[in-house]
Interface confidence: medium
């Protein structure tokens, strides 16, 4: 039998979508405008080489990165589309609204739609972990809760904790993770007798996989710098991560046939493990003075990634109901944690070595700051859960996990393609 | 308390050199970006050079690149303006300006001018 | 090159705007906008950074932001003593950073 999106998804989603896309476009018209003026032309085409970086990570790296299930891989890529297109358009408008609205209007620059990729990732990120149990409609749901609640957490973070623009978007890796792994807390959890292996990667779209990884292996470096404006800091910043994803590379593979009794090497530790220096950096990738720093956390970094991945799986997938291939979430959620401690440990040498006083303040700012963004991922990712349980969203019969075929017309309907 | 004193302002010929100097009291200078910045007489403020609290990195409006160098001697909580071929629209007040503390994320990095000295005037005039 | 008003007048306890535009484009948080206050004789004295951000010795009545794409600095309440040239400062990268031609406040 055809396996259609149920009646009620079907009457749902396009409803939902639609609506939501004629209130954005409203919004677009009635609060936005270019900024009009002549920017210097080097000037515009390295800002838009940064933000295609930032998008080709996002819709063809995210995307394909998480594409490894054996039924499950169109919906994987199409819904990260999905996805960062909208997210893209409501981060516009929020952080808009949040730094320039008692103008009454928000000017659009190539730095805002940077900005605004970069916060529609942290969804991709997160919801590595759910992927599979939602429906579109969900996923919606989704995107706009983890924009908003990101957007008002680097407000609140700017205003508070007077951190820049780079500081305040690093903390994307923590609060990615967390609030991917407290929605999929949320979701119903036991895959049903049957359907156990629809959760297994298969070769070609381990491959795919494996591609998606290789893009944000080639553009971590951009992520990381995006925000910078001094070009020192940029400069380190893209240094800095590439010495350490390289590192991770290595030690990823090395580590992955080292933790196997075979010595064999598993791809589900590479595709996550080779991106770990890149996250592990990621907030002090402007502060490292020399390359051998950024290596070391590369291979520290590389070794936690393999570590978690063999040790962790079993632990989510028995308390969150994440499969075994979905370890983006610990992962970012181990490594942000890394990078966030390197960051207070490389401010108070920074502080220690300027003569400068106040570093139990320093100090004590930045874990405030670390803790506000788990907490606010925390209690969204819930919020979120609780949102994406409701019965409106006809979310799919757990029998119906990780299937292709729920949301896809294929013209020969197969089992295996 | 914070302060910055500049020294080394005089009168002098077009093509002549000067070298202005400031002292900072009541912090380490090498904490932070430190900032040369001056006004025309009747004019608004521009901003002419900083360095860097290593001294790694420096900047210099393009009007001055090639003729004004600046530098610090931590160790003597100093930074220095080496003023070359001067010109009569060098003249000016020339202010030294510091932050004082620094951003976090950018700790190193500053482009805060937070405290500024009383001014030192240089005139260019034959 | 930063614009500003050349010239505002406001009445003790009016509110008023200073705007800072950059010819480059929208000013953003990315330029972490300064502004500066000087009186006649005196050295400037800094009265706000990064947008919004105040001093210890910044008088509550002053409070910076971004407005239509420029920075803005607004005083409430505004004072006899605050007949002034402000300036404002951006960042534009690199080793560059640029004042506004400066806004004379007076206060009738």
């Known amino acids: 039998m055809s396996s259609k999106y149920p009646r009620s998804v079907r009457r749902c989603l396009p409803l939902w979508a639609l609506t939501l896309e004629a209130a954005l476009i409203l919004l677009f018209y009635f609060f936005t405008h270019y900024d009009a003026s002549l920017e210097d032309q080097k000037g515009l085409v390295a800002s838009y080489q940064v933000g295609q970086d930032l998008t080709v990570m996002a819709a063809i790296g995210l995307g394909f990165l998480t594409s490894s299930f054996r039924r499950h891989s169109w919906s994987s890529v199409a819904f990260n589309l999905f996805m960062l297109a909208l997210g893209v358009q409501w981060a516009i408008l929020l952080d808009g609204f949040l730094s320039q609205f008692p103008s009454g209007k928000v000017v659009i620059t190539l730095f805002s739609i940077r900005l605004a990729t970069m916060s529609a990732l942290s969804v991709l990120i997160s919801v590595d972990a759910v992927l599979g149990k939602v429906n579109l409609a969900q996923l919606v749901v989704m995107v706009l809760v983890e924009v908003t609640a990101l957007g008002n957490l680097r407000m609140v973070i700017s205003n508070i904790f007077n951190t820049d623009y780079h500081m305040n978007m690093m903390h994307i890796y923590v609060f990615a993770a967390y609030f991917g792994l407290s929605v999929a807390w949320c979701l119903p959890k036991p895959l049903p007798e049957g359907t156990e292996d629809k959760d297994q990667t298969a070769t070609i779209p381990s491959l795919s996989a494996m591609l998606g990884a290789l893009f944000l292996w080639m553009f971590w470096p951009s992520f990381n710098s995006a925000l910078l404006r001094s070009p020192i800091e940029r400069k380190n910043a893209v240094f800095n991560t590439y010495y350490a994803v390289a590192v991770s590379v290595v030690t990823a593979i090395s580590g992955s046939s080292l933790a196997h009794p075979q010595g064999k090497i598993s791809k589900t530790y590479v595709h996550s493990a080779v991106l770990a220096g890149g996250v592990a950096v990621g907030t002090s990738c402007h502060l490292i003075p020399s390359p051998w720093l950024a290596m070391v956390l590369g291979l520290v970094a590389g070794l936690i990634s393999v570590g978690g991945a063999k040790y962790l799986p079993g632990c989510c997938n028995r308390v969150l109901g994440i499969p075994h291939s979905s370890i983006m979430g610990y992962n970012f959620s181990l490594l942000g944690l890394l990078g966030e401690i390197i960051y207070i440990v490389l401010l108070v040498l920074d502080t220690v070595g300027a003569g400068n006083g106040m570093i139990g303040f320093q100090v004590l700012l930045s874990i405030g700051e670390l803790s506000l963004a788990i907490v606010i991922a925390l209690m969204s990712g819930l919020l979120t859960g609780l949102l994406l349980n409701l019965k409106i969203w006809k979310a799919p019969h757990e029998a119906k996990y990780f299937d292709d075929q729920v949301f896809w017309k294929f013209p020969h309907l197969a089992v295996g393609f | 308390q914070v302060k910055l004193l500049e020294s080394g302002g005089g009168v002098v010929q077009p093509g002549g050199s000067l070298r202005l100097s400031c002292v900072a009291s009541?912090?380490?200078?090498?904490?932070?970006?430190m900032h040369w910045v001056r006004q025309a007489p009747g004019k608004g403020l521009e901003w002419v050079a900083f360095?860097?609290?290593?001294?790694?990195?420096?900047?210099y409006v393009d009007s001055v690149k090639g003729r004004f160098t600046i530098s610090r001697d931590n160790s003597k909580n100093m930074v220095y303006l080496q003023m070359n071929s001067l010109r009569a629209d060098d003249t000016a007040v020339y202010y030294y300006c510091a932050r004082e503390k620094a951003l976090r994320g950018i700790s190193r990095y500053n482009y805060y001018l937070d405290v500024w000295g009383k001014g030192t005037t240089v005139t260019v005039s034959s | 090159v930063v614009t500003q008003e050349p010239s505002l007048t406001v009445s003790p306890g009016g509110t008023v705007t200073l705007t800072c535009a950059s010819s480059?484009?929208?000013?953003?948080?990315?330029?972490?906008p300064n502004w500066f206050q000087q009186k006649p004789g005196q050295a400037p004295r800094a009265l706000i950074y990064s947008t919004n951000k105040k001093h210890s010795w910044t008088p509550a009545r002053f409070s910076g932001s971004l407005l239509g794409g420029k920075a803005a600095l607004t005083l409430s309440g505004v004072q006899p003593e605050d007949e002034a040239e402000y300036y404002c400062?951006?960042?534009?990268?690199?080793?560059?950073?640029?004042f506004g031609g400066g806004t004379k406040l007076t206060v009738l």
């Open positions: 400062l951006l960042y534009y990268g690199g080793a560059q950073l640029v």
């Open positions: 009541g912090f380490t200078l090498r904490s932070y970006g």
């Open positions: 480059t484009g929208a000013v953003t948080r990315g330029y972490y």
């Open positions: 360095i860097w609290f290593d001294g790694s990195n420096k900047g």
